[in-house]
Amino acid sequence: QDSRGCARWCPQDSSCVNATACRCNPGFSSFSEIITTPMETCDDINECATLSKVSCGKFSDCWNTEGSYDCVCSPGYEPVSGAKTFKNESENTCQDVDECQQNPRLCKSYGTCVNTLGSYTCQCLPGFKLKPEDPKLCTDVNECTSGQNPCHSSTHCLNNVGSYQCRCRPGWQPIPGSPNGPNNTVCEDVDECSSGQHQCDSSTVCFNTVGSYSCRCRPGWKPRHGIPNNQKDTVCEDMTFSTWTPPPGVHSQTLSRFFDKVQDLGRDYKPGLANNTIQSILQALDELLEAPGDLETLPRLQQHCVASHLLDGLEDVLRGLSKNLSNGLLNFSYPAGTELSLEVQKQVDRSVTLRQNQAVMQLDWNQAQKSGDPGPSVVGLVSIPGMGKLLAEAPLVLEPEKQMLLHETHQGLLQDGSPILLSDVISAFLSNNDTQNLSSPVTFTFSHRSVIPRQKVLCVFWEHGQNGCGHWATTGCSTIGTRDTSTICRCTHLSSFAVLMAHYDVQEEDPVLTVIT
């Protein structure tokens, strides 16, 4: 007990009434109004509790404190009086704060601030939406990926900040009357090939594709080394030149010079130059054969190989080049006697006759074109008298049956060996290179030097042999009739042809030599 009459054991937040009793301080309460034992406690009264008599008024919040309370304006409101806290509704001067006026950048870009009681909202501009994680921030709506599919399928959607565009895809253009950009844009494929908007090299043909185009090598051309075919940047070279080189293993200055000219022509070649290029090649060949130079010093076998290589390559080159000629008949002749006759036509149903100084060729147009080949039909005949120099002493290989027949009617091959070339060597070719088995035969009429009496005249072709060289052969060719200076031959394939006089001694009149013409 306190001598002054005040209890010393009063619990926290209470004061003594007398020596034996205590009372809770204002703002605190205990189980009974007067505390008589130290076991009792004083607890804070929450004046802000719902059942409390305290009323702070509108736009305000009650904040409980230890032993008391404060009234404060709610967020978004402020007291007109300037007093931060107050105790009851009569002291309440809270009014709405206009955050939009206070801070014009509140909604950042692309949004308009709208004041609300106690707060504000951001109203996004068209093409923007509130960010879910930050409802005060307007972010661009990507109309292209939002699943709205705002554009026509012929266009592609381009998202812009706050908007979008429907643009024609590359290689497409707006249909007549359509804009290019708004959501009502409708497009159609541009035919770059026919409109001339392509950038195909002249060595290629333009092919339109949906929304684009490609450049394919012309027939008889191939992509330059390392460049793929069928691309926009494809550049091609004429196959007919790129691989016509001297035969590996044959070394001749004259031949090298000829092939250097051929390669130069190939490098500068454009389809429009086909006519000139053909003439230049034949001119070069004519000059080569007129003055063979060191070719004549090569061993005979090598000379035959060179002739074989020249005949083979010439046929390929002329076939390739003639596909780029316009329809009609061409005739060229050169000083040393080389002659070319060429007819180019769209497929026609008739026979064709090509006439030259020393040879005439007759065949059916239908042979000329391979089925499914879109190009023009070409029939060509080249007379190459100069080739005879290189083919001197070339062997003749007869089929066993013909060999036997000759042995029956002739005494056999005389000792002086190789047959004599009576005619010019001619080479026949078609746009169709599959000419090993013609559906109807080709007829050749050769003019040639006189036949020595009692000698066998044979229609022959040059067979490119196993060793890349070759020999004369008669397979598939028959002699229809012969006179002193002309012979008619009929063959079931195309190649290079000639009339030979074989050194057989005719024992009796040979019915084969009877003139049928």
């Epitope: 691989t243 590996p248 293993g249 060793n467 890349g468």
Partner: antibody, heavy 120, light 107 residues
């Protein structure tokens, strides 16, 4: 016995030069055309050059034309391949080979090869 | 350039089998094609020249055929020592070009 022995290979920087040699024995060297053929690290074979028996004709693919020079010394029975402006794609094992008589132009004898590496 | 294509990069066979390796030229090369065998760690060696001529000392189980654009090398009665890479080569025109090679594996 026909024998071809290459030498002169090694490591060289891009743009650098190297001279390969091929010593021949056991045959009439001056009667045969000869070639260099290389084998890339991926095992592809590539023809590099050919020289005629007398040495007055040489042939090259576009990939080496103007950079490589093939020559021969028939008195010494030796071939030379002078390589300049070397590129990484020239990295290979280089073989010299003898050609059979034309028109059978097969390469009937090959050396063991010399390795060339072009790298920085 | 004439492209020589060996479409089979690898071929697997057993001793005693017959196998055909093919080579296709991008254009007519007549018969100017050779076949070469390269055993591991060795230089190439000619087997066949001019498409079908077996070279001296080459066993007769190796046969070459073809002309124009399609060529084949046939190995009948394959032996374990035939494990090698096989290359075709054309010498019809310059540049001389090889096929990419076919690796023969023996099971």
């Amino acid at each position: 016995e026909v024998k071809l022995v290459e030498s002169g290979g090694g490591l060289v920087k891009p743009g650098g030069s190297l001279k390969l040699s091929c010593a021949a024995s056991g045959f009439a060297f001056s009667s045969y055309d000869m070639s260099w053929v290389r084998q890339t690290p991926e095992k592809r074979l590539e023809w590099v050059a050919t020289i005629s028996s007398g040495g007055n004709y040489t042939y090259y693919p576009d990939s080496v034309k103007g950079r490589f020079t093939f020559s021969r010394d028939n008195a010494r029975n030796t071939l030379y391949l002078q390589m300049s402006s070397l590129r990484s794609e020239d990295t290979a094992l280089y073989y010299c080979a003898r050609h059979y008589d034309y028109p059978d132009y097969a390469m009937d004898y090959w050396g063991q090869g010399t390795s060339v590496t072009v790298s920085s | 350039d004439i492209v020589m294509t060996q479409s089979q990069k690898f071929m697997s066979t057993s001793v005693g089998d017959r196998i055909i390796i093919t080579c296709k030229a991008s254009q007519n090369v007549r018969t100017t094609v050779d076949w070469y065998q390269q055993k591991p760690g060795q230089s190439p060696k000619v087997l066949i020249s001019l498409a079908s001529n077996r070279h001296t000392g080459v066993p007769d189980r190796f046969t070459g055929s073809g002309s124009g654009t399609d060529f084949t090398l046939t190995i009948s009665n394959v032996q374990s020592e035939d494990l090698a890479d096989y290359f075709c080569l054309q010498h019809r025109n310059y540049p001389l070009t090889f096929g990419g090679g076919t690796k023969l594996e023996i099971k």
